[in-house]
C-alpha cells in the first residue's frame, strides 16, 4: 500500500516517499523506484539552510555599503551572508536592511546603554547628584563634584546639566 | 509507470530544422530536470543538453550551443528540443531522459539523419 | 568538454572479475560524487547501473560495482556473466553545470 506520510527528511511524490535535498542542495529530480532523490550543490552567492526540496537556492544577501551596511559573517550554501553596519550605525530592523547613525543622548541625558551595530544608543535622565552637559554617544551621566572632599563649599548648585560650583569656605575672623 | 515517448526525428537536409518531442507521464514531470543526449551511429553517449523544472535554467554541449534549443512544456508534460543549422554531424539517435546529470528513464529513441 | 577516458575495450573470461576505467578531471570527475556507469546492448537504450559513484539502482546485479580515487572512476564486475556483454559508458557531472559521457568500452566475454 503506498504511504500516506512520509519520515523526517522526506517528502511524498507520486506515492512514494523520497529522502530531501541536504542544506546547501537543490532538487534536480525526485527519486524514482531505483535510485535515490537527485540533488545539486547551490552555486556562488546562493544557499539552502534547509533540508529541502526547493528547485532554487536563494541568493545571499547583499551588504550594500551605500547603506552603510557591511559583512559580518560571509555566506556558505547552507548559510546567509550576516550584514551589520558600519561602525557608529545601527541596523533599523532585525533584518539589518538598511543603517542608520546612533542616536546621541542631549545634555541633562547620559547613556544607558551604548548603541552595537543592531541596536541603538539608550539614553537616561541624569537623576539627581549627576549631570551631563555635552551631547555624546558615549558619555555617561557624571556625579557632581564633591565640595567637601575637597574643603570646599559649594557656592552654585548642579542640575542635570551642569555640575555644582566649589568655593572656597567662609574663614571666621 | 514511467514513460517517455519520442517523435519528431526524420530524414532533413544540411541547414535544415526539426523539432523532437518527448511526452512524459507516470511520474510528476514538472519537478524533475529532463536531459538530451545522442549518439551517433556506431558511436558513443554524448550529452546534449538539460533544463531545470520551470525552464529558468538549461545548459547545452558547445557544439549545438546557438543552433539546438531544449524547451519544456509542464502543462502538457513535454519536452523538446528544436535543431537548427544542421549539420551532418548531427545525425545521430537522440534519446531524452528523465534528470540533470542521471539518468534511470529513456525515451526509446529518436534517429536524426542530416543528408543532401 | 573532452569526453572521459575509458579503454576502448576489456575482455574476460566467465566468473573473473574486470575493471573498467573512466578518467576526467578535477573539473568533473574529481570534483564531484556524480559519476554515473551506464550498460547498454545493442539496438537498446542504455540502463542505468551505478549512479553517485557507488550506488546501484534497486533490481542491479550487486556483481556491479562503483569507486572513485581523484580524477579516475571505476566499475568493477564481478563474477563475469555472458549477458554482461555490451558497451559501458561513464559520465560525470562538470564545473559548468554539464554532463560529459566517457567514450565508451565494449566488454566481450570470452568463451
Known amino acids: 500500500e503506498p504511504p500516506t506520510a512520509c519520515r523526517e527528511k522526506q517528502y511524498l511524490i507520486n506515492s512514494q516517499c523520497c529522502s530531501l535535498c541536504q542544506p546547501g542542495q537543490k532538487l534536480v529530480s525526485d527519486c524514482t523506484e531505483f535510485t535515490e532523490t537527485e540533488c545539486l550543490p547551490c552555486g556562488e552567492s546562493e544557499f539552502l539552510d534547509t533540508w529541502n526540496r526547493e528547485t532554487h537556492c536563494h541568493q545571499h544577501k547583499y551588504c550594500d555599503p551605500n547603506l552603510g551596511l557591511r559583512v559580518q559573517q560571509k555566506g556558505t550554501s547552507e548559510t546567509d551572508t550576516i550584514c551589520t553596519c558600519e561602525e557608529g550605525w545601527h541596523c533599523t530592523s532585525e533584518a539589518c536592511e538598511s543603517c542608520v547613525l546612533h542616536r546621541s543622548c542631549s545634555p541633562g541625558f547620559g547613556v544607558k546603554q551604548i548603541a552595537t551595530g543592531v541596536s541603538d544608543t539608550i539614553c537616561e535622565p541624569c537623576p539627581v547628584g549627576f549631570f551631563s552637559n555635552v551631547s555624546s554617544a558615549f558619555e555617561k551621566c557624571h556625579p557632581w563634584t564633591s565640595c567637601e572632599t575637597k574643603d570646599l563649599v559649594v557656592q552654585q548648585a548642579g542640575t542635570n546639566k551642569t555640575d555644582v560650583v566649589c568655593g572656597p569656605q567662609d574663614r571666621l575672623r | 509507470q514511467v514513460q517517455l515517448v519520442q517523435s519528431g526525428g526524420g530524414l532533413v537536409q544540411p541547414g535544415g530544422s526539426l523539432r523532437l518531442s518527448c511526452a512524459a507521464s507516470?511520474?510528476?514531470?514538472?519537478?524533475?530536470?529532463m536531459s538530451w543526449v545522442r549518439q551517433a551511429p556506431g558511436k558513443g553517449l554524448e550529452w546534449v543538453a538539460n533544463i531545470n523544472q520551470d525552464g529558468s535554467e538549461k545548459y547545452y554541449v558547445d557544439s549545438v550551443k546557438g543552433r539546438f534549443t531544449i524547451s519544456r512544456d509542464n502543462a502538457k508534460n513535454s519536452l523538446y528540443l528544436q535543431l537548427n543549422s544542421l549539420r551532418a554531424e548531427d545525425t545521430a539517435e537522440y534519446y531524452c531522459?528523465?534528470?540533470?546529470?542521471?539518468?534511470?528513464?529513456w525515451g526509446q529513441g529518436t534517429l536524426v539523419t542530416v543528408s543532401s | 568538454q573532452s569526453a572521459l577516458t575509458q579503454p576502448a575495450s576489456v575482455s574476460g573470461s566467465p566468473g573473473q572479475s574486470i575493471t573498467i576505467s573512466c578518467t576526467g578531471t578535477s573539473s568533473d570527475v574529481g570534483g564531484y560524487n556524480y559519476v554515473s556507469w551506464y550498460q547498454q546492448h545493442p539496438g537498446k537504450a542504455p540502463k542505468l547501473i551505478i549512479y553517485?559513484?557507488?550506488n546501484r539502482p534497486s533490481g542491479v546485479s550487486n556483481r556491479f560495482s562503483g569507486s572513485k580515487s581523484a580524477n579516475t572512476a571505476s566499475l568493477t564486475i564481478s563474477g563475469l556473466q555472458a549477458e554482461d556483454e555490451a558497451d559501458y559508458y561513464c559520465s560525470s557531472y562538470t564545473s559548468s553545470s554539464t554532463l560529459v559521457f566517457g567514450g565508451g568500452t565494449e566488454l566481450t566475454v570470452l568463451g
Open positions: 553517485d559513484v557507488t
Open positions: 531522459a528523465r534528470g540533470g546529470y542521471r539518468y534511470a528513464y
Open positions: 507516470g511520474f510528476t514531470f514538472s519537478s524533475n530536470w
